[in-house]
């Protein structure tokens, strides 16, 4: 995949950022040991990776969270990798679910998502979770990225 | 990524090896259905994958472990993917954490880590865990690898 | 990996399909937001991805399942990524294991497998689980794919 100017490498890896926003969409930052290969992929509004070129991409996310069965809802913790293409509704690409731990005060668990998807120019991918307050933001625990095949 | 001599494929996949060494760094071997594309990536001292060429790499590790909450420390089992570049301290690229199981004698869990990172010539990546004695070395359970984009 | 006609992109991502078959091999379909780059990779009999070209492939699978410790066997839930090459016995490439949850009626957990492997022309990869009836088939929960380096 070492490519010429006509076909440059496109890759990104961004790092989780704690947020006070009351939204299920996780926030990310270009900080620490991040990757942003060039302007053909961008992090927009700290929440979505947007690509300029059509093609096949391997997209991945890792989410570490700490939760307790008694303090959480009955529903499991779910992380979703979602796609928003121009002129289309958003859709779920991948999901993972983990039942809350019985450990006190909370039990840590990590989820990894990854798959190959066709993206259109201007398409954005983002990560949703059921409870962002449970997400762990320590070094390396929660990250999000992609690479163009 | 099918490439010419100027730009060969670089990829590795190595298999976990039980070790009596008293270190948190996991040991690996070129055994079973392993991959070592060429000498542009090498397994050094059974513990680190070292690359000769600068570039973007997708690096991954999978660790399966068996632990019990009562027999383990309060802290969760943590697997860390770490980077050591020449002339730099080692640094954490990715981490995953799983709280110990209440199952007896121990409960198995699997962790997967993966992300895209820029590596310098001579850079090494390795995997650290909180308790190597809990790692499962049965066929396919614990492995480590990379591919150059 | 943007390639010419001589060296086209090869990638697939298929979606889990509930099955009444009494087999441990998971079933997949080209439905939803699936990927099938061209006829150099095919989904055969709804259960295996078969490649026509030799080379290095990153192969991955994600399995979400819901199980309960009391209602399940003592053994953990295991997902295996397996290889069948022409004229060879099948072999395990990767495995992950998760102990059943104590949550009622069942606790959801997600497993992710991925690694780089050399495949021969005509080689097939497939996914085995200990109990297919426990697998979750909701949108995005369980998928399987590969990409040629």
């Amino acid at each position: 995949m070492q490519k010429g100017d006509q076909n440059p490498q496109i890759a990104a890896h961004v790092i989780s950022e704690a947020s006070s926003k009351t939204t299920s969409v996780l926030q990310w930052a270009e900080k620490g040991y991040y990757t942003m290969s060039n302007n053909l992929v961008t992090l927009e509004n700290g929440k979505q990776l947007t690509v300029k070129r059509q093609g096949l991409y391997y997209i991945y996310a890792q989410v570490t969270f700490c939760s307790n069965r008694e303090a959480s809802s009955q529903a499991p913790f779910i992380a979703s990798l979602c796609l928003k293409s121009p002129g289309r509704f958003e859709r779920i690409l991948l999901r993972a679910a983990n039942t809350h731990s019985s450990a006190k005060p909370c039990g840590q668990q990590s989820i990894h998502l990854g798959g190959v998807f066709e993206l259109q120019p201007g398409a954005s991918v983002f990560v949703n979770v059921t409870d962002p307050s449970q997400v762990s933001h320590g070094t390396g625990f929660t990250s999000f990225g992609l690479l163009k095949l | 990524m099918q490439k010419g001599d100027q730009n060969p494929q670089i990829a590795a996949h190595v298999i976990s090896e039980a070790s009596s060494k008293t270190t948190s760094v996991l040991q690996w071997a070129e055994k079973g259905y392993y991959t070592m594309s060429n000498n542009l990536v090498t397994l050094e001292n059974g513990k680190q994958l070292t690359v000769k060429r600068q570039g973007l790499y997708y690096i991954y590790a999978q660790v399966t472990f068996c632990s019990n909450r009562e027999a383990s420390s309060q802290a969760p089992f943590i697997a860390s993917l770490c980077l050591k570049s020449p002339g730099r301290f080692e640094r954490i690229l990715l981490r995953a954490a799983n709280t110990h199981s209440s199952a007896k004698p121990c409960g198995q869990q699997s962790i997967h880590l993966g992300g895209v990172f820029e590596l310098q010539p001579g850079a090494s990546v390795f995997v650290n865990v909180t308790d190597p004695s809990q790692v499962s070395h049965g066929t396919g359970f614990t492995s480590f690898g990379l591919l150059k984009l | 990996m943007q390639k010419g006609d001589q060296n086209p992109q090869i990638a697939a991502h298929v979606i889990s399909e509930a099955s009444s078959k009494t087999t441990s091999v998971l079933q997949w379909a080209e439905k939803g937001y699936y990927t099938m780059s061209n006829n150099l990779v095919t989904l055969e009999n709804g259960k295996q991805l078969t490649v026509k070209r030799q080379g290095l492939y990153y192969i991955y699978a994600q399995v979400t399942f819901c199980s309960n410790r009391e209602a399940s066997s003592q053994a953990p839930f295991i997902a295996s990524l397996c290889l069948k090459s022409p004229g060879r016995f099948e072999r395990i490439l990767l495995r992950a294991a998760n102990t059943h949850s104590s949550a009622k009626p069942c606790g959801q957990q997600s497993i992710h497998l991925g690694g780089v492997f050399e495949l021969q022309p005509g080689a097939s990869v497939f996914v085995n689980v200990t109990d297919p009836s426990q697998v979750s088939h909701g949108t995005g929960f369980t998928s399987f794919g590969l990409l040629k380096l």
């Epitope: - | 050094e44 513990k47 080692e90 001579g122 390795f126 | -």
Partner: nanobody, 116 residues
Framework: EVQLLESGGDLVQPGGSLRLSCAAS????????MMWVRQAPGKGLEWVSE????????YYADSVKGRFTISRDNSKNTLYLQMNSLRAEDTAVYYC?????????WGQGTLVTVSS
């Protein structure tokens, strides 16, 4: 049991020299890249120098380049740091460590004080 025992630290005048040693035991020394790190009073850890397993590749922090020389004797399981043209800012506790898994094992360190 893994042990790293640093020695050779002393009080020395600016411009002077010292040779630090690190005796390793409990692991296969020749399998490990090794390094020297230091901690000045009230400061964080600073990477100083490192050497590969065979001793064929060495690296130095800019602040010590041309003044310090790292070496090893695998037959004696010992790491060395030859320190020349010492300056006041080299005052620190010096530790040796493995380059991979550096936080697994630490010795007591050896104190180098550069003062007139």
């Amino acid at each position: 049991e893994v042990q790293l025992l640093e020695s050779g630290g002393d009080l020395v005048q600016p411009g002077g020299s010292l040779r630090l040693s690190c005796a390793a035991s409990g692991f296969t020394f020749s399998d490990e890249g090794m390094m020297w790190v230091r901690q000045a009073p009230g400061k964080g850890l600073e990477w100083v120098s490192e050497i590969n397993q065979q001793g064929s590749a060495t690296y130095y922090a800019d602040s010590v380049k041309g003044r310090f020389t790292i070496s090893r004797d695998n037959s004696k399981n010992t790491l060395y740091l030859q320190m020349n043209s010492l300056r006041a800012e080299d005052t620190a506790v010096y530790y040796c460590a493995k380059t991979i898994g550096m936080f697994d094992y630490w010795g007591q360190g050896t104190l180098v004080t550069v003062s007139s």
